[in-house]
Interface confidence: low
């Protein structure tokens, strides 16, 4: 049902032990009660007890306190639970009768049998609150107080408000007075089921499935879920989208795996040479004198070019070579000669002519021999 | 005639378990609350606990909550007392009785005993 | 919760005296008070209900009085068989508790 009308009785006083008809019982009034809950009417008239009924045991003799028993068992306050919306008023009839057996049933008692009866109208609003009363007449007097809850899950000034509190699947919240959810702590929506990321949370990027976590949205990471990631295999470059690779400067290809600036990143070019880059991962080094190799590793030596003439031997330095010439000539790579044919220079049977440039003279080599003078035999 | 008659006592370890039963015959069980009072050996009653057998609803003492349970069995006329986690001074004898609506104990069992010991 | 609190713990008496039982409550019962009858090896009987109201079957040598904190039982001339214990029982509120017993014994 959606609430509860309770009726707790509290003391009911019949000292002289008589029924309504003033006729004593033998050997007291063993009592209890039938209570009738109605509709409003203007005058209470018998009819059907349109919003309940409920009997009692016999709860004493004559005169007597009922116990309370407010752990909610049913007994004291007594319970008579409607599924409808409480109209705000009501009707009730409390007879007291005796039970000269133990046979409570209204067919098994005489008609005489009744101790008294009352009957009340009037307004009742929904709340927690006891009202307290007391109906007296010349023979007896009963206390009881009354009030309408709502039962569990219902709510609002006429209990017409279902709300049940959950935290599952379906939503995370406890019920308001009024019958309005709210929310569970990290969780919110109009039923309390979308989970309240972590803060800071990227709101594009980033999820949750519960309260104060952040998951990812594919192509993006990072504990809030802000930082995108590159294309796989990116090497040497970044991105501002997922799966992009913008190479870093001096980088190239499509995972920026390319180095377009060999000669800073790796200055291959030894012994002073200058580095020119020629595209990716070429270079070429421009060697100064004296050294020689893709990578002016080598160092040159000048006497392998053979510079020396005229039988001139040669001789490495630090600032490149020297020729030692035989006697009878001179120059930096032994040119010159201070000999004629009158000297007979020519060997192993070459013939002498004489000349004006540079030379002196020139030797005319017979086969087999050669050198300026015919002095090397020819394998 | 009204009749409560208890069984299922004897002798349990501590933190052991235990269920007496209370078959009610005489009166209408559903009509009726019943209540588990005890006697520890040369003491006086403590109440248990009660049940309403038509709704199922109980009370307890704070000495037993939590880890004893009331039950009804509105077929068998008879209530239940489970009895876990025991202790040694929840050793004594268990009566049923029925408990009238003022909160009174017109009938009783002739009990049970139960002791818990190692 | 409500304690009850009997006296005398014991006492002695002969066949044919009046026996008084008093039961203090800790708070006010009204008259949600029971008093039982208990022999050795036997359980408790009901004598009085709602203070002062004699259980059907119980032998009119025993009444009981009183309301608000303070309950008598009262035996007018003790026979054999009413060596016993006897203990008070409030029904009032919360749960039930009984006083700690009053043991009537032979003089």
């Known amino acids: 049902g959606s609430g509860v009308f309770q009726l707790q009785l509290q003391e009911f006083i019949n000292e002289r032990g008589v029924l309504a008809s003033g006729r004593p019982c033998e050997p007291g009034c063993r009592t209890f009660f039938r209570v009738c809950l109605k509709h409003f009417q203007a005058v209470v008239s018998p009819g059907p007890c349109t919003f309940g009924t409920v009997s009692t045991p016999v709860l004493g003799t004559n005169s007597f306190a009922v116990r309370d028993d407010s752990s909610g068992g049913g007994r004291n306050p007594l319970q008579l639970p409607f599924n409808f919306t409480w109209p705000g008023t009501f009707s009730l009839i409390i007879e007291a009768w005796h039970a000269p057996g133990d046979d409570l049933r209204p067919e098994a008692l005489p008609p005489d049998a009744l101790i008294s009866k009352i009957a009340i109208q009037g307004s009742l609003a929904v709340g927690q609150n006891w009202l307290l009363d007391e109906q007296t007449s010349t023979l007896t007097r009963l206390r009881y107080s009354y009030r309408v809850i709502c039962s569990d899950n219902y709510y609002g000034d006429n209990c017409s408000r279902l709300c049940k509190k959950r935290n599952d699947h379906f939503g995370h919240y406890v019920c308001q007075p009024d019958g309005n959810l709210s929310c569970l702590p990290g969780w919110t929506g109009e039923y309390c089921q979308q989970p309240i990321c972590l803060s800071g949370c990227h709101e594009q990027n980033g999820y949750c499935s519960k309260p104060a976590e952040c998951l990812c949205r594919p192509g993006w990471q990072g504990r809030l879920c802000n930082e995108c990631i590159p294309h796989n295999g990116c090497r040497h470059g970044t991105c501002s989208t997922p799966w992009q690779c913008t190479c870093d400067e001096g980088w190239g290809g499509l995972f920026c795996d390319q180095d377009l600036n060999y000669c800073t990143h790796h200055s291959p070019c030894k012994n002073g040479a200058t580095c020119s880059n020629s595209g990716q991962r070429s270079y070429t080094c421009t060697c100064r004198p004296g050294y020689t190799g893709v990578d002016c590793e080598l160092e040159l030596s000048e006497c392998d070019s053979n510079p020396c003439r005229n039988g001139g031997s040669c001789k490495d330095q630090e600032d490149g070579y020297h020729c030692l010439c035989p006697p009878g000539y001179y120059g930096l790579h032994c040119e010159h000669s201070t000999l004629s044919c009158a000297d007979s220079p020519c060997f192993n049977g070459g013939s002498c002519r004489e000349r004006n440039q540079g030379a002196n003279y020139a030797c005319e080599c017979p086969p087999n021999f050669t050198g300026s003078n015919c002095e090397k035999k020819v394998d | 005639e009204v009749q409560l008659v208890e069984s299922g006592g004897g002798l349990v370890q501590p933190g052991g378990s235990l269920r007496l039963s209370c078959a009610a015959s005489?009166?209408?069980?559903?009509?009726?609350?019943i209540s588990w009072v005890r006697q520890a050996p040369g003491k006086g009653l403590e109440w248990v606990g009660v049940i309403n057998p038509n709704s199922g609803a109980t009370e307890y003492a704070d000495s037993v909550k939590g880890r004893f349970t009331i039950s009804a069995d509105t077929s068998k006329n008879t209530a239940y007392l489970q009895m876990n986690s025991l202790r040694a001074e929840d050793t004594a004898v268990y009566y049923c009785a029925r408990d009238n609506f003022g909160g009174y104990f017109d009938y009783w069992g002739q009990g049970t005993l139960v002791t818990v010991s190692s | 919760d409500i304690q009850m609190t009997q006296s005398p713990s014991s006492l002695s008496a002969s066949v044919g005296d009046r026996v008084t039982i008093t039961c203090r409550a800790s708070?006010?019962?009204?008259?949600?008070v029971a008093w039982y009858q208990q022999k050795p090896g036997k359980a408790p009987k009901l004598l009085i209900y709602s203070a002062s109201f004699l259980y059907s079957g119980v032998p009119s040598r025993f009444s009981g009085s009183g309301s608000g904190t303070d309950f008598t039982l009262t035996i007018s001339s003790l026979q054999p068989e009413d060596f016993a214990t006897y203990y008070c029982q409030q029904s009032y509120n919360g749960p039930s508790t009984f006083g700690q017993g009053t043991k009537v014994e032979i003089k």
């Open positions: 005489g009166f209408t069980f559903t009509d009726n609350w």
């Open positions: 708070q006010d019962v009204s008259t949600a």
